[in-house]
Interface confidence: medium
C-alpha cells in the first residue's frame, strides 16, 4: 500500500479551498493540528481540519446531496408536471367541445327548446368538469338532473306546445313522471353508464399523474440524516483535511455510502414500478366507453336520439301524463 | 349550480369541426407518456448509482479515497475501510424510511390498487351488454370515420377522435425547460463545492 503523501505543512491549500465554502479564515488552522476533537474526519496523524470546519463540511455535503437528488429527478418531474397540465387542459377542452356540440344540436334541431336547454346543458358539463377536477359529484345525479330539467321543456314546447300558461305549474310532476314512465327509454341509463365509466377513468388517470408529481416532490425534498451527512462528509471532504485536494472517492465506496443514505428512498422502487405498469394498463384500456373524448363528443347524438324517442312516443305519453299531472297541485309527484 | 365556467358557445362554427388536423390524439399522447415513463421505471433503484456517477468519483485514477486513506482503486480496501469503526451502516439501513416516504408509499399502494381495479377485464363486461341492448349505432362501424349522430338536420361527422391537441400550447417554452425555472439554485457559496 503506498504511503500517504505528506500533509500540507502550512494548511494553505486547505484554507484557500475552505474560503470558498465559508468566507473568513478563522476556522482553518495555520499548520496541521492533532485534531483530537474531530468526530467525523478522524485523523491518523496531523490534520488541517477543525471541529467547526467539519460541521460546515457536513452541512455542505447534505446540501450537495439534496442538489444531486433534485437534478437526478428533474427530467422525470418535468415530464409528469408538463403532462398532468396538458391532460387536464385537454380534458377541459373536450368538455367544452362536447358542450358546444350539444348546444349546436339543440339550436339546429330543437330551436324552441333554447335557451333553457343551453342552461341545463351548461350546468351538466360544468358538473362534468368539476367531477374530473375531483369534486364530490355523483354522475348518476348529474345525468338525472339533465333529463329531469329537459323533460318539462320538451313536454311544454314540443309535445304539447298549445298548453296554456296556467298549466305551467306541472313541472315538478313532469320531472317525476320522467323517471316513472321511462320517458327517454334506456338512454339516460346508457349515458350514465358511459359517462360514469369514462369520467372515472379520466379522473383516476389525472389523480395518478398528480400523485407522480407528489412522489417526486417528496423524494426531491428529503432531508438527509446526520448519519448520512457524516458518511458523505467522510467520502467527499475528509481527504481535504490531509491536504489531498485532488483525490476522488472510490467508486465502490461511493455506492455503499449512497445505498446507506438512500435505503429509505429505494424502498419506493417496488411501488414506483408497479405504479408505471398499472398506469400503462389503465391507458391501454382507455377506449370506447372508457375514453371520455369518445363518450363526451358523442353525447349530443345520444341526447338527440333520446329526444327522438320521446317524440316517437309522444301520443301515448301525452295522454298518460295528461291524466297523471292533471291534479299536480294537489298531488306532487316527487 | 351558480358556479360555472364562462360560456364558450361558438354557435355555427361548431358544426364545421374546423380543428387543425394533428397527428397527436389524446390517446397517442397518453401512450407516448407511458413510453417515456417506462424509461424511468428503475428510477429509484438506480438513484444511488446515478448520484455516484454525477459526483466526483475516481474513474481513471490509480488511487482513490475510501473515507480514511488513499488506496488503490481495485483493492478490497477501496470499498471497505472507510466504513470500519465509523458507525454501523446496517443500522442506518435498518432505521427504515422517513415518515414522509412511508406516507408516499401508502399513497402509491392506494393508487396502484385503484388503477388495477379500473383495468380489470371483468370491469369490461358492460361493453358487451351495451351492444346487446342495441345502443350502438348500427350504421357506423369502428372505421376511421365514426358517425356522431344518426339522423336529422345538423348532424355532423367527426374524423375519428378530435385532433384538437394542436390547440394546446404544450410545446415547452424556453423558460419552462429543465435547467431554467425548474433548477434549484441555492447560494453559490453553498453549492457546487466539489473540487475536481
Amino acid at each position: 500500500q503506498p504511503p500517504p503523501p505528506p500533509p500540507d505543512a502550512t494548511c494553505h491549500q486547505v484554507r484557500s479551498f475552505f474560503q470558498r465554502l465559508q468566507p473568513g479564515l478563522k476556522w482553518v488552522p495555520e499548520t496541521p493540528v492533532p485534531g483530537s476533537d474531530l468526530q467525523v474526519c478522524l485523523p491518523k496523524g496531523p490534520t488541517c481540519c477543525s471541529r467547526k470546519m467539519e460541521e460546515k463540511y457536513q452541512l455542505t455535503a447534505r446540501l450537495n446531496m439534496e442538489q444531486l437528488l433534485q437534478s437526478a429527478s428533474m427530467e422525470l418531474k418535468f415530464l409528469i408536471i408538463q403532462n398532468a397540465a396538458v391532460f387536464q387542459e385537454a380534458f377541459e377542452i373536450v368538455v367544452r367541445h362536447a358542450k358546444n356540440y350539444t348546444n349546436a344540436m339543440f339550436k339546429n334541431n330543437y330551436p324552441s327548446l333554447t335557451p333553457q336547454a343551453f342552461e341545463f346543458v351548461g350546468e351538466f358539463f360544468t358538473d362534468v368538469s368539476l367531477y374530473i377536477l375531483g369534486s364530490d359529484i355523483n354522475v348518476d345525479d348529474m345525468v338525472n338532473e339533465l333529463f329531469d330539467s329537459l323533460f318539462p321543456v320538451i313536454y311544454t314546447q314540443l309535445m304539447n306546445p298549445g298548453l296554456p300558461d296556467s298549466a305551467l305549474d306541472i313541472n315538478e310532476c313532469l320531472r317525476g313522471a320522467r323517471r316513472d314512465l321511462k320517458v327517454f327509454g334506456n338512454f339516460p341509463k346508457l349515458i350514465m353508464t358511459q359517462v360514469s365509466k369514462s369520467l372515472q377513468v379520466t379522473r383516476i388517470f389525472l389523480q395518478a399523474l398528480n400523485l407522480g408529481i407528489e412522489v417526486i416532490n417528496t423524494t426531491d425534498h428529503l432531508k438527509f440524516s446526520k448519519d448520512c451527512g457524516r458518511m458523505l462528509t467522510r467520502m467527499w471532504y475528509c481527504s481535504y483535511c490531509q491536504g489531498l485536494m485532488m483525490v476522488k472517492p472510490c467508486g465502490g465506496y461511493c455506492n455503499v455510502v449512497m445505498q446507506g443514505c438512500m435505503a429509505g428512498v429505494v424502498e419506493i422502487d417496488k411501488y414506483w414500478r408497479e405504479y408505471i405498469l398499472s398506469l400503462e394498463e389503465l391507458v391501454n384500456g382507455m377506449y370506447r366507453i372508457y375514453d371520455m373524448e369518445n363518450v363526451l363528443l358523442g353525447l349530443f347524438s345520444t341526447i338527440h336520439d333520446s329526444i327522438q324517442y320521446v317524440q316517437k312516443n309522444a301520443g301515448k305519453l301525452t295522454t298518460t301524463i295528461g291524466k297523471l299531472c292533471a291534479h299536480s297541485q294537489q298531488r306532487q309527484y316527487r | 349550480s351558480a358556479y360555472y365556467p364562462e360560456d364558450l358557445f361558438i354557435d355555427k362554427k361548431v358544426l364545421k369541426v374546423a380543428h387543425v388536423e394533428h397527428e397527436e390524439t389524446l390517446s397517442s399522447r397518453r401512450r407516448e407518456l407511458i413510453q417515456k415513463l417506462k424509461s424511468f421505471i428503475s428510477f429509484y433503484s438506480a438513484l444511488p448509482g446515478y448520484i455516484c456517477s454525477h459526483s466526483p468519483v475516481a474513474e481513471n485514477d490509480t488511487l482513490c479515497w475510501n473515507g480514511q486513506e488513499l488506496v488503490e482503486r481495485y483493492s478490497q480496501k477501496a470499498a471497505r475501510n472507510g466504513m470500519k469503526n465509523q458507525f454501523n451502516l446496517h443500522e442506518l439501513k435498518m432505521k427504515g424510511p422517513e415518515p414522509v416516504v412511508s406516507q408516499i408509499i401508502d399513497k402509491l399502494k392506494h393508487i396502484n390498487q385503484l388503477l388495477r381495479t379500473m383495468s380489470m377485464p371483468k370491469g369490461r363486461v358492460l361493453d358487451k351488454n351495451l351492444d346487446e341492448e342495441g345502443f350502438e349505432s348500427g350504421d357506423c362501424g369502428d372505421d376511421e370515420d365514426e358517425c356522431i349522430g344518426g339522423s336529422g338536420d345538423g348532424m355532423i361527422k367527426v374524423k375519428n377522435q378530435l385532433r384538437f391537441l394542436a390547440e394546446l400550447a404544450y410545446d415547452l417554452d424556453v423558460d419552462d425547460a429543465p435547467g431554467n425555472s425548474q433548477q434549484a439554485t441555492p447560494k453559490d457559496n453553498e453549492i457546487s463545492t466539489f473540487h475536481n
Epitope: 387542459e89 368539476l130 377536477l133 359529484i137 389523480q207 | 425555472s181
Partner: antibody, heavy 124, light 107 residues
C-alpha cells in the same frame, strides 16, 4: 426561488374598472392552475376565480360572475384579473395563488404559494 | 356551498402552551380540509393539507386531525412566531370555501 409578484391595485369609483396582474417566477407557470382569492378589510378569505393551466376553462364565485374575467399569458408567466362594474363590496386585498394538487380528491383548489397581495378600494 | 365554522374566534395563550383550533363543516368534506396561517400584512401560508399532512417546510409542532365534518389544528408548543390568524379551507365540494378564522394571540 418561487415568487408571485402582484401589481395593479388602487382606488376606483363604483362602476369603474381595474386590472390586476400577477407575475410568476421560479416554477413552470404554464403547468399550474392559478386562482384569485380576496380578503375584505378585517374579514376572512374568499375564493374569487380559477383558471386552468392552459387557460381553456375559468371558474368564478357567484359574487363576481359576469363582472370579473380571469386570464393568463403563459409566454409572459403572468396571470390577470380584469374587474369591471366594481362595487363597494369588492373592496379587499386581492391575492393571486397557485393551485396545487396533493393526491386525494384530485382538485386543484389548494393554494400552496401566494402573491404578496394588492389592495383594491372601491369608493366614491 | 359548504360553510366552515371555526372556534374559538380568539384564543389567548402564552408561548410554550398548546393551542387547539377547531373547524366544523356544514356537511362532510371527507378529509379534504386545509389549514392556513396568516400574519398581519402578509399573505396566507399553507400549513396542513388533507386534514393531517404537513406542507413542505412546516415545523412538526403543527398537526392536523379529523375527517368528515370535525377537524382540529394543534400547535403542540406555541413559539412567538405562531401568533397569527388561522383559516381552514375545504376543497371537497364546489366552490372552495374558507372558515372565518381563529386568532391566536399572546395572553
Amino acid at each position: 426561488q418561487m415568487q408571485l409578484v402582484q401589481s395593479g391595485g388602487g382606488l376606483v369609483q363604483p362602476g369603474g374598472s381595474l386590472r390586476l396582474s400577477c407575475a410568476a417566477s421560479g416554477f413552470s407557470f404554464s403547468s399550474y392552475a392559478m386562482n384569485w382569492v380576496r380578503q375584505a378589510p378585517g374579514k376572512g378569505l374568499e375564493w374569487v376565480s380559477y383558471i386552468t393551466s392552459g387557460g381553456s376553462s375559468r371558474y368564478y364565485a357567484d359574487s363576481v360572475k359576469g363582472r370579473f374575467t380571469i386570464s393568463r399569458d403563459n409566454a409572459k408567466n403572468s396571470l390577470y384579473l380584469q374587474m369591471n362594474s366594481l362595487r363597494d363590496e369588492d373592496t379587499a386585498v386581492y391575492y393571486c395563488a397557485r393551485g396545487t394538487y396533493y393526491y386525494g380528491s384530485g382538485n386543484y383548489f389548494l393554494f400552496d404559494h401566494w402573491g404578496q397581495g394588492t389592495m383594491v378600494t372601491v369608493s366614491s | 356551498e359548504i360553510v366552515l365554522t371555526q372556534s374559538p374566534a380568539t384564543l389567548s395563550l402564552s408561548p410554550g402552551e398548546r393551542a387547539t383550533l377547531s373547524c366544523r363543516a356544514s356537511q362532510s368534506v371527507s378529509s379534504y380540509l386545509a389549514w392556513y396561517q396568516q400574519k398581519p400584512g402578509q399573505a396566507p401560508r399553507l400549513l396542513i393539507y388533507d386534514a393531517s399532512n404537513r406542507a413542505t417546510g412546516i415545523p412538526a409542532r403543527f398537526s392536523g386531525s379529523g375527517s368528515g365534518t370535525d377537524f382540529t389544528l394543534t400547535i403542540s408548543s406555541l413559539e412567538p412566531e405562531d401568533f397569527a390568524v388561522y383559516y381552514c379551507q375545504q376543497r371537497s365540494n364546489w366552490p372552495p370555501t374558507f372558515g372565518q378564522g381563529t386568532k391566536v394571540e399572546i395572553k
